[in-house]
């Protein structure tokens, strides 16, 4: 893959190591901790990036949500196994032998079990709520600029086309973004939601994962957008399987 | 081999409504963007608007909208791109062309349709 | 809509001759930037998409180059059969895509 032309680096993502080693002379990225080639012209893949970011591992903890099928990752930090596409592989395991089912976006969806654990298939998130609370300003942002703005901003930045943008809810300070993927609604290069959600709450915790780009710079009719928390909802095709002494 | 093949050439009166067919085959068509392009003669390309097959989600260039209309048969695999209350400066060369999600590239093109308007 | 601007507009050159046509966006379209060669009566044809990837199956003797606002088509050694009509076409925003006004390469 070509990257940046002229210096050999990664635009979408800085954990890479490059070098003009590619077909040509041309320049090649590889991710840190897993050595595979990415596209450097779009996202990378969630697994991907939690494999790279790899260095001090935290333990994964998912709650299941209000709504009785979200699950909610909070910051869950492992070391994951990623397929040859670089998704997620639907069983992950520890080094101690302790095993659990995830979705598509890496969130743990089952109870922990051992290596006997079965995960049939890798299940597709395929409705992401992104629930932001935004610092005090002057006043209200006007809902139809919000709602184009955060559209461009997720198809400019993050590549992700505005069809799978479902809606734009804001009640101030809260705004909800949706995003929406089939399986089948995907085509060609377009790039999944897990990946452009990961991102932006990358973004907006300040940890950019773009190359040499500046932080996220979120303005509304010039009114810059601020946000103080973030939550993030993961709703699955198949609802998640846990035990009811998790419920409880 | 992929392939696009358009419908023939049409003259229509002012007023009228135009339907351009253009069938894929050579590849799945659910998986990719079609896009339409038209070419005025002797003029550049003008994008109209674009549709994907697998669940018939469309957008057009607010230039066309309430005049486009595109549309998908999944079943023969073929795209449909109907265009209404035709003027004379809608005379032009109408293409579908397959695109990438990503980069918004038309890998693959059909021959083009020429759509004359004339009274 | 951002515009995009090719120069010039046509241009003459001999077989052999090494040529660069131009391309400008109103704004900034990091690398979404795409070729396409177009002769009379013919479908357009995509040669270079994302700045610089090269199409399979086009020669190697066309290039691009560029990021942002300024992006350039290099051919380095024209052949016969590289007389034609020549687009930029950004990918970067939301829809509508837009064209150049095309550069017509024409025999000296």
């Known amino acids: 893959h070509t990257a940046a032309q002229d210096n050999c680096t990664c635009p979408t993502n800085k954990m890479t190591v490059c070098s003009p080693d590619g077909p040509g002379g041309r320049c090649q990225c590889r991710a840190l901790g897993s050595g595979m080639a990415v596209d450097c012209s779009t996202l990378t893949s969630k697994c991907l990036l939690l494999k790279a970011r790899m260095s001090a591992p935290k333990n994964a903890r998912t709650l299941v949500r209000p709504s009785e099928h979200a699950l909610v990752d909070n910051d869950g930090l492992y070391d994951p196994d990623c397929d040859p596409e670089g998704r997620f592989k639907a069983r992950q395991c520890n080094q101690t032998s302790v095993c659990w089912c995830v979705n598509s976006v890496g969130v743990r969806r089952t109870d922990k079990g051992d290596l006997s654990l079965r995960c049939d298939e890798l299940v597709r998130t395929h409705h992401i709520l992104i629930d932001l609370r935004h610092r005090p300003t002057a006043g209200a942002f006007n809902h139809s600029d919000l709602d184009a703005e955060l559209r461009r901003l997720f198809r400019e930045r993050y590549r992700l086309h505005p069809k799978f943008v479902a809606a734009v809810h804001y009640e101030q300070p809260t705004i909800q973004i949706e995003l929406r993927q089939n399986t089948s609604q995907k085509a060609a290069g377009d790039v999944d939601i897990g990946d452009a959600a990961y991102y932006f709450e990358r973004d907006i915790k300040g940890e950019s994962l773009f190359q040499g780009r500046g932080g996220l710079d979120l303005r509304v009719r010039g009114e810059p957008l601020q946000v103080e928390r973030t939550l993030i909802y993961y709703l699955d095709e198949i609802p998640p399987k846990f035990s009811m002494k998790r419920l409880t | 081999q992929v392939q696009l093949v358009q419908s023939g050439a049409e003259v229509k009166k002012p007023g009228a409504s135009v339907k351009v067919s253009c069938k894929a085959s050579?590849?799945?068509?659910?998986?990719?963007?079609m896009h339409w392009v038209r070419q005025a003669p002797g003029q550049g390309l003008e994008w109209m608007g674009e549709i994907t097959p697998s669940d018939n989600y469309t957008s057009y260039a607010q230039k066309f909208k309430g005049r486009v209309t595109i549309t998908r048969d999944t079943s023969t695999s073929t795209a449909y791109m109907e265009l209404s209350s035709l003027r004379s400066e809608d005379t032009a060369v109408y293409y579908c062309?397959?695109?990438?999600?990503?980069?918004?590239?038309?890998?693959?093109w059909g021959q083009g349709t020429l759509v004359t308007v004339s009274s | 809509d951002i515009q995009m601007t090719q120069s010039p507009s046509s241009l003459s050159a001999s077989v052999g001759d090494r040529v660069t046509i131009t391309c400008r966006a109103s704004q900034d379209i990091s690398n979404y930037l795409n070729w396409y060669q177009q002769k009379p009566g013919k479908a357009p044809k995509l040669l270079i998409y994302?700045?610089?990837r090269l199409e399979s199956g086009v020669p190697s003797r066309f290039s691009g180059s560029g990021s942002g606002t300024d992006f350039t088509l290099t051919i380095s050694s024209l052949q016969p059969e590289d007389f034609a009509t020549y687009f930029c076409?950004?990918?970067?925003?939301?829809?509508?895509?837009?064209f150049g006004q095309g550069t017509k390469l024409e025999i000296k």
């Open positions: 062309a397959r695109g990438h999600g990503n980069y918004v590239s038309f890998d693959y």
């Open positions: 050579g590849y799945t068509f659910t998986s990719y963007w």
């Open positions: 994302y700045t610089s």
């Open positions: 076409q950004q990918g970067y925003t939301l829809p509508p895509y837009t």
